[in-house]
C-alpha cells in the first residue's frame, strides 16, 4: 500500500495562555526531501487553513512571521504549537502532510485533534 498515513492526538487542552501543542507524525511511503505541513481547522463542515510551512528534510520548519503557528521537525515527526487561541477557537485541527519532492507526490491527512480552549477568568481586583 502506497498511501501515506498521518497520526495526531485525538484531544489537546490549550494552556491558560491560549497555547496548544501537539505532535503530527506521518508514515512516509517515499524518500521525500521537501515536505509541506498544513494545519486546517474544521468547524461546522467549513474548513479553513490556520497555517502552513514547507521544509527541507533535515532543516527547521519555518512558518511565516505573522503565523500563529510555530513548529519543529524531527524525521517523520512534526511538533506543532498554535498560539493566541481563545474559547471561540475551540475546534478540530487537522494535520495535513504533503510530500512535495521528489516525485511522486503523496498526500496524508490526519483525523484531527480536538483542541479545547478555555478563556481564563479575569483576575479579581486586589488591594495589594
Amino acid at each position: 500500500c502506497k498511501a501515506m498515513h498521518v497520526a495526531q492526538p485525538a484531544v489537546v487542552l490549550a494552556s491558560s495562555r491560549g497555547i496548544a501543542s501537539f505532535v503530527c507524525e506521518y508514515a512516509s511511503p517515499g524518500k521525500a526531501t521537501e515536505v509541506r505541513v498544513t494545519v486546517l481547522r474544521q468547524a461546522d463542515s467549513q474548513v479553513t487553513e490556520v497555517c502552513a510551512a514547507t521544509y527541507m528534510m533535515g532543516n527547521e520548519l519555518t512558518f511565516l512571521d505573522d503565523s500563529i503557528c510555530t513548529g519543529t521537525s524531527s524525521g517523520n515527526q512534526v511538533n506543532l504549537t498554535i498560539q493566541g487561541l481563545r474559547a471561540m477557537d475551540t475546534g478540530l485541527y487537522i494535520c495535513k502532510v504533503e510530500l512535495m519532492y521528489p516525485p511522486p507526490y503523496y498526500l496524508g491527512i490526519g483525523n484531527g485533534t480536538q483542541i479545547y480552549v478555555i478563556d481564563p477568568e479575569p483576575c479579581p481586583d486586589s488591594d495589594f
Epitope: 500500500c1 498511501a3 498544513t38 495535513k96 512535495m100 511522486p104 507526490y105 498526500l107 491527512i109
Partner: antibody, heavy 118, light 108 residues
Framework: QVQLVESGGGVVQPGRSLRLSCTAS????????MDWVRQAPGKGLEWVAV????????YYADSVKGRFTISGDSSKNTLYLQMNSLRAEDTAVYYC???????????WGQGTLVTVSS | EIVLTQSPGTLSLSPGERATLSCRAS???????LAWYQQKPGQAPRLLIY???SRATGIPDRFSGSGSGTDFTLTISRLEPEDFAVYYC?????????FGPGTKVDIK
C-alpha cells in the same frame, strides 16, 4: 464566491502551440493546488497537470510530459497551461480546477475547447 | 499509477430507485483520498464526495460514499430527475491523480 474562468481555446494545427489561461477569484491562489483536467469528446476525465502553492512544484500526466507546462501568476490570480507540439489526441475540453483543502477538486471552471486538426 | 475501474458502465433506473455505483482500485487507496464527481452533459464536473465518505458543500444527503482499501461505493438513496448523469471516482493520494472511466446513470 469562488470562480474559475478559462480562456484561450480554439482550433490549432498539429505541431503548433496554444496557451490556456484560467482566472481565479474569491480565494487566495497560493493556498491551493491548481490543476488542469481534460475531457476528449464523448470520453472520460483525464488529469493533466498540477501546480502547488509557491509554484516550484509541478507534476504532469505522462501523456503530456515534456510538451505541456503549467504555471501560475499569483499577482494576477491566473493559472496557465502552455501546450506545445500539439497532437490530434490532445483535442478536448480543458478544465481548470482547484484542489480542495481536504482533497478532491472542489471548484471547476466551465472549460475551454481545444481542437487540434489540420 | 493507480488504475480505477468503475462498474457498471451504465445503470438504467427509474426516479425514486436506489443507485449503487462501484469503484475499484488496482492498489490500496487510503479512504481519505478518494472522491466522487457528477457530470451532466455540457457542464463541468461537480464534487460530490471527498475522503470516500464526506459530502462536499451543498450536496444533498441522498448521496453517500463508503468503502476502503480497493473497493468504494457511491450510493444515491432515491434518484431524483436531476441525478441522471455520469459519475466518476478519482484518487488524489498520490501522483499521477487518476479518474475512473465513469458510470452513466440513465432513465429506464
Amino acid at each position: 464566491q469562488v470562480q474559475l474562468v478559462e480562456s484561450g481555446g480554439g482550433v490549432v494545427q498539429p505541431g503548433r502551440s496554444l496557451r490556456l489561461s484560467c482566472t481565479a477569484s474569491g480565494f487566495t491562489f497560493s493556498s491551493y493546488g491548481m490543476d488542469w483536467v481534460r475531457q476528449a469528446p464523448g470520453k472520460g476525465l483525464e488529469w493533466v497537470a498540477v501546480i502547488w502553492y509557491d509554484g516550484r512544484n509541478k507534476y504532469y500526466a505522462d501523456s503530456v510530459k515534456g510538451r505541456f507546462t503549467i504555471s501560475g501568476d499569483s499577482s494576477k490570480n491566473t493559472l496557465y497551461l502552455q501546450m506545445n507540439s500539439l497532437r490530434a489526441e490532445d483535442t478536448a475540453v480543458y478544465y481548470c480546477a482547484r484542489g480542495g483543502l481536504l482533497g478532491g477538486f472542489d471548484y471547476w471552471g466551465q472549460g475551454t475547447l481545444v481542437t487540434v486538426s489540420s | 499509477e493507480i488504475v480505477l475501474t468503475q462498474s457498471p458502465g451504465t445503470l438504467s433506473l427509474s426516479p425514486g430507485e436506489r443507485a449503487t455505483l462501484s469503484c475499484r482500485a488496482s492498489q490500496s487507496v487510503s479512504s481519505s483520498y478518494l472522491a466522487w464527481y457528477q457530470q451532466k452533459p455540457g457542464q463541468a464536473p461537480r464534487l460530490l464526495i471527498y475522503g470516500a465518505s464526506s459530502r462536499a458543500t451543498g450536496i444533498p444527503d441522498r448521496f453517500s460514499g463508503s468503502g476502503s482499501g480497493t473497493d468504494f461505493t457511491l450510493t444515491i438513496s432515491r434518484l431524483e430527475p436531476e441525478d441522471f448523469a455520469v459519475y466518476y471516482c478519482q484518487q488524489y493520494g498520490s501522483s499521477p491523480f487518476t479518474f475512473g472511466p465513469g458510470t452513466k446513470v440513465d432513465i429506464k
